[in-house]
């Protein structure tokens, strides 16, 4: 099964890699384009089914986009000697549906990883931490780009997709140095509550174009370095006091809230009051009520508490059939 293979050791891979001849420092794999001056290798739109074994040691930027990799096994980039310079790895749109534990091990300089536009039915909890220890060696990753990695419904495992991604982000507290995390366009219905607590260095968090209905159980409190929080194009109805206070307490943050179906009833009063005095929301005058119909298109900033009412809920004895 996926989970069994994900926890298998990468030692056999390393042994076979070690027995092979070390790559020549200036050779370029078949179906790739290489520039030693730019420290860049591009193997793009070549229908590759596995990561080339003979990558040049100088590679700093590796593009493996638009391929058909399917599975990224443990030690997929482990080489002898290691690819010690590799800093940016782009695997977007390569039809990956499985990323196993330890897939990015032995890349000591890897700062940026882009797995976007891959339908990840299985993402190992140890994909980024490399081990199942409760506290792993810190990952060198600074930027992790995971936009549109949700698989189609028929390829989803029974467990929640949100939970699977969260497990990979928090495993071993390996991503404590992460500055940028993009999780846009993943149909997230919620954000698991413990995720952000394990990512204290975040400066940029993109959760746009998901289906987040509420942030009630999400805590931003410890994200003291956060500069940009993208929540556009979700299903947010209102932000409650706890969330508002946490956002206001972040010293550098800019929050983007466009294109959410704000419900302008009595529960919106606190958010309207906050919007009128806060400087953290970008383009706040573009926020408009979506519901109820009588309030549709009203600008939130122009509302008064008298505008925000809730229809009284009649006790059963007063309800008409």
């Amino acid at each position: 099964t996926s989970s069994a293979s994900s926890s298998s050791s990468s030692a056999p891979f390393l042994a076979s890699a070690a027995s092979a001849q070390p790559p020549l420092p200036d050779q370029c794999p078949a179906l790739c384009e290489c520039s030693e001056a730019a420290r860049t290798v591009k193997c793009v739109n070549r229908n590759l089914t596995e990561v080339p074994t003979d990558l040049p040691l100088y590679v700093r930027n590796l593009f493996l986009t638009g391929n058909q990799l399917a599975v990224l096994p443990a030690g997929a980039f482990a080489r002898r000697p290691p690819l010690a310079e590799l800093a940016a790895l782009n695997l977007s749109g390569s039809r990956l549906d499985e990323v196993r534990g330890g897939a990015f091990e032995h890349l000591p300089s890897l700062r940026q990883l882009d797995l976007s536009h891959n339908p990840l039915a299985y993402l190992s909890p140890f994909a980024f931490s490399g081990s199942n220890a409760s506290i792993s060696a810190p990952s060198p990753l600074v930027e992790l780009i995971l936009n549109h990695i949700v698989p189609p419904d028929d390829k989803r495992q029974n467990r929640s997709f949100e939970g699977m991604v969260a497990a990979a982000l928090v495993a071993g507290r390996a991503l404590q140095g992460l500055h940028l995390l993009e999780l846009a366009s993943n149909h997230f219905l919620y954000l698991p509550r413990d995720v952000l607590a394990q990512l204290p260095s975040l400066r940029y968090l993109d959760l746009s174009n998901n289906s987040l209905v509420s942030l009630t159980y999400v805590s931003f409190r410890n994200l003291t370095h956060l500069e940009s929080l993208h929540l556009e194009d979700n299903a947010l109805k209102v932000l409650h006091n706890g969330t508002l206070a946490e956002l206001q307490g972040l010293p550098h943050v800019r929050v983007f809230l466009d294109n959410n179906p704000w419900v302008c009833d009595c529960h919106m009063a606190d958010m309207v009051t906050w919007l009128k005095q806060t400087g953290v929301v970008q383009g706040k005058d573009r926020l408009t009520c979506a519901f109820p119909e009588k309030m549709r298109n009203r600008v939130l900033l122009e509302l008064n508490s008298a505008d925000l009412d809730c229809d009284p809920i009649l006790p059963p004895s007063l309800q008409t059939s």
Epitope: D233, D285, V299
Partner: antibody, heavy 116, light 107 residues
Framework: QVQLQQSGAELMKPGASVKLSCKAT????????IEWIKQRPGHGLEWIGE????????DYNEKFKGKATFTADTSSNTAYMQLSSLTTEDSAIYYC?????????WGQGTLVTVSA | DIQMTQTTSSLSASLGDRVTISCSAS??????LNWYQQKPDGTVKLLIY???SLHSGVPSRFSGSGSGTDYSLTISNLEPEDIATYYC?????????FGGGTKLEIK
């Protein structure tokens, strides 16, 4: 009830500028965005941009930046769109509407004809 | 920009017919779609907002449906006053964009 009353037809020379008006009644003018729409025969409807009257905030379709300029006068509940450096491509009917998630109420349109 | 396509530019139907007008977006628009009716005299009215919500005062013979990139407007029982051009419009991403329109005529 909500009404948007637009100014009358204009016949303009190429290179000139024209300022169209849209007077809103029946609602709180500052509480909603006003949108401007262009319609040329055979070109369908095109969104030019929008203005939030009370705050002067504007958004423009990139295609119309430098061509259209929006203003609003809250004392008279009137929104304006100025079109500059007119060419025959600007000949069209221009609508103002109340937005932003949908264009709920529309003015009757102003026909602008640009001809030498 | 998001392109909105109404493949049928005109269609002819008889009074009492059920008529469906389709509209497709160049990318997913999350049900952020409206339908408008423009009468021959130029008057424009909102019919449907957010894919399927009927605007107040609009007859119940009008309905909307769809998801993702594909949407439709249905008139269940065509009346003489429904002769008009119908436009879809997305509000998922600025600039807001319209379909090219479908002109409905009586046979």
């Amino acid at each position: 009830q909500v009404q948007l009353q637009q100014s009358g037809a204009e016949l303009m020379k190429p290179g000139a500028s024209v300022k169209l008006s849209c007077k809103a009644t029946g609602y709180t003018f500052t509480g909603y965005w006003i949108e401007w729409i262009k319609q040329r025969p055979g070109h369908g409807l095109e969104w030019i941009g929008e203005i939030l009257p009370g705050r002067g905030s504007t958004d423009y379709n990139e295609k119309f930046k430098g061509k259209a300029t929006f203003t609003a006068d809250t004392s008279s509940n009137t929104a304006y769109m100025q079109l500059s450096s007119l060419t025959t491509e600007d000949s069209a009917i221009y609508y103002c509407t109340r937005g932003r998630l949908d264009f709920t109420y529309w003015g009757q349109g102003t026909l602008v004809t640009v001809s030498a | 920009d998001i392109q909105m396509t109404q493949t049928t530019s005109s269609l002819s139907a008889s009074l009492g017919d059920r008529v469906t007008i389709s509209c497709s977006a160049s990318q997913g628009i999350r049900n952020y779609l409206n339908w408008y009716q423009q009468k021959p005299d130029g008057t424009v009215k909102l019919l449907i907002y957010y894919t399927s919500s009927l605007h107040s005062g609009v007859p119940s013979r009008f309905s909307g449906s769809g998801s993702g990139t594909d949407y439709s407007l249905t008139i269940s029982n065509l009346e003489p006053e429904d002769i008009a051009t119908y436009y879809c419009q997305q509000y998922s991403k600025v600039p807001w964009t319209f379909g090219g329109g479908t002109k409905l005529e009586i046979k």
